[in-house]
């Protein structure tokens, strides 16, 4: 048994720097406690963007200062990352861990390439 994680290959952030994508995992068992982490991979360096642990059937809660928000429905997590700028363009990986009950399972998606284009500044009006 293994856990597979699916996420879209490409997402374009909105002009306000908001990107949303779905992270779906094929659970080999009936997990009650799940940890979802968004990782950013750039030049083979991996860093954590945000993480949340949730109980199945409950809402996904990120820390107050997190740039992520999300909702869960069954084995699907809808993730939104805000405050993105052009320099944040990169590969965003969804990592899912089934923490409880045993056994533990790890699932890592192939990543979603998020493209962020900074909006053009408004021209000064006379």
């Amino acid at each position: 048994k293994a856990m597979h994680v699916a996420q879209p290959a490409v997402v374009l952030a909105s002009s306000r720097g908001i990107a949303s994508f779905v992270c779906e995992y094929a659970s080999p068992g009936k997990a009650t406690e799940v940890r979802v982490t968004v990782l950013r991979q750039a030049d083979s360096q991996v860093t954590e963007v945000c993480a949340a642990t949730y109980m199945m059937g409950n809402e996904l809660t990120f820390l107050d200062d997190s740039i992520c928000t999300g909702t869960s429905s069954g084995n699907q997590v809808n993730l939104t990352i805000q405050g993105l700028r052009a320099m944040d363009t990169g590969l965003y990986i969804c990592k899912v861990e089934l923490m409880y009950p045993p056994p533990y399972y790890l699932g890592i998606g192939n990543g979603t390439q998020i493209y962020v284009i900074d909006p053009e500044p408004c021209p000064d009006s006379d």
């Epitope: 990782l39 991996v46 954590e48 993480a51 056994p103 790890l106």
Partner: antibody
Framework: QVQLVESGGGVVQPGRSLRLSCAAS????????MHWVRQAPGKGLEWVTF????????YYADSVKGRFTISRDNSKNTLYLQMNSLRAEDTAIYYC???????????WGQGTLVTVSS | EIVLTQSPGTLSLSPGERATLSCRAS???????LAWYQQKPGQAPRLLIY???SRATGIPDRFSGSGSGTDFTLTISRLEPEDFAVYYC?????????FGQGTKVEIK
């Protein structure tokens, strides 16, 4: 830089207890799951136990279940292994290891030797 | 529990030669959650390869991993004197985390 330093090993009689510590530095300890792995003299690596980010979830190898307890203090950046009812077959070098972002054990301590002998 | 079996137990080669190490799993290792570690006498293991084929930070490109499912391979294209050590494979996709018994690469 990432550093893991184990301590607490030594010689102990069968049936007695020992507590190992692993002091972590150079990274945000609470953001990583951690493991203990052991290696008997001249043998291979054996996974012992795992602990989640907040210490809420713990998993153990069958060989130590009910005797060993893993814990962590995120405020002290320290991982612990409480070993009770020690047996001769528990004699090994005990390593603490960090789980990397993508799953493998990316950093290991230098190990601490536990010898169970009468 | 996923049991990992490494072969051969010992590999006797000369510097400059190619080393091919095998790791076979008793059941499928999901999404290639397989790692390779190098261990030298008196030292802790060091991560070489993760995800079956991705090199860890600072690992020379003479080390490469391949395989999927139940059969995995670690290849050292040209052995350097510092490569003579014991190599372990490990699966980390589910608990219990398991290691192979190791392959010793020794100087011929």
């Amino acid at each position: 830089q990432v550093q893991l330093v184990e301590s607490g090993g030594g010689v102990v009689q069968p049936g007695r207890s020992l507590r190992l510590s692993c002091a972590a530095s150079g990274f945000t300890f609470s953001s990583y799951t951690m493991h203990w792995v052991r290696q008997a003299p001249g043998k291979g690596l054996e996974w012992v136990t795992f602990i989640s980010y907040d210490g809420h979830n713990k998993y153990y190898a069958d060989s130590v279940k009910g005797r060993f307890t893993i814990s962590r203090d995120n405020s002290k950046n320290t991982l612990y292994l409480q070993m009770n009812s020690l047996r001769a077959e528990d004699t090994a070098i005990y390593y603490c290891a960090r789980t990397g972002w993508l799953g493998p054990f990316d950093y290991w301590g230098q190990g601490t030797l536990v010898t169970v002998s009468s | 529990e996923i049991v990992l079996t490494q072969s051969p137990g010992t590999l006797s080669l000369s510097p400059g030669e190619r080393a091919t190490l095998s790791c076979r799993a008793s059941q499928e290792v999901g999404d290639s959650y397989l790692a390779w570690y190098q261990q030298k006498p008196g030292q802790a293991p060091r991560l070489l390869i993760y995800g079956a084929f991705s090199r860890a930070t600072g690992i020379p490109d003479r080390f490469s991993g391949s395989g999927s499912g139940t059969d995995f391979t670690l290849t050292i294209s040209r052995l350097e004197p510092e490569d003579f050590a014991v190599y372990y494979c490990q699966q980390y996709g589910s608990s219990p985390w398991t290691f192979g018994q190791g392959t010793k690469v020794e100087i011929k």
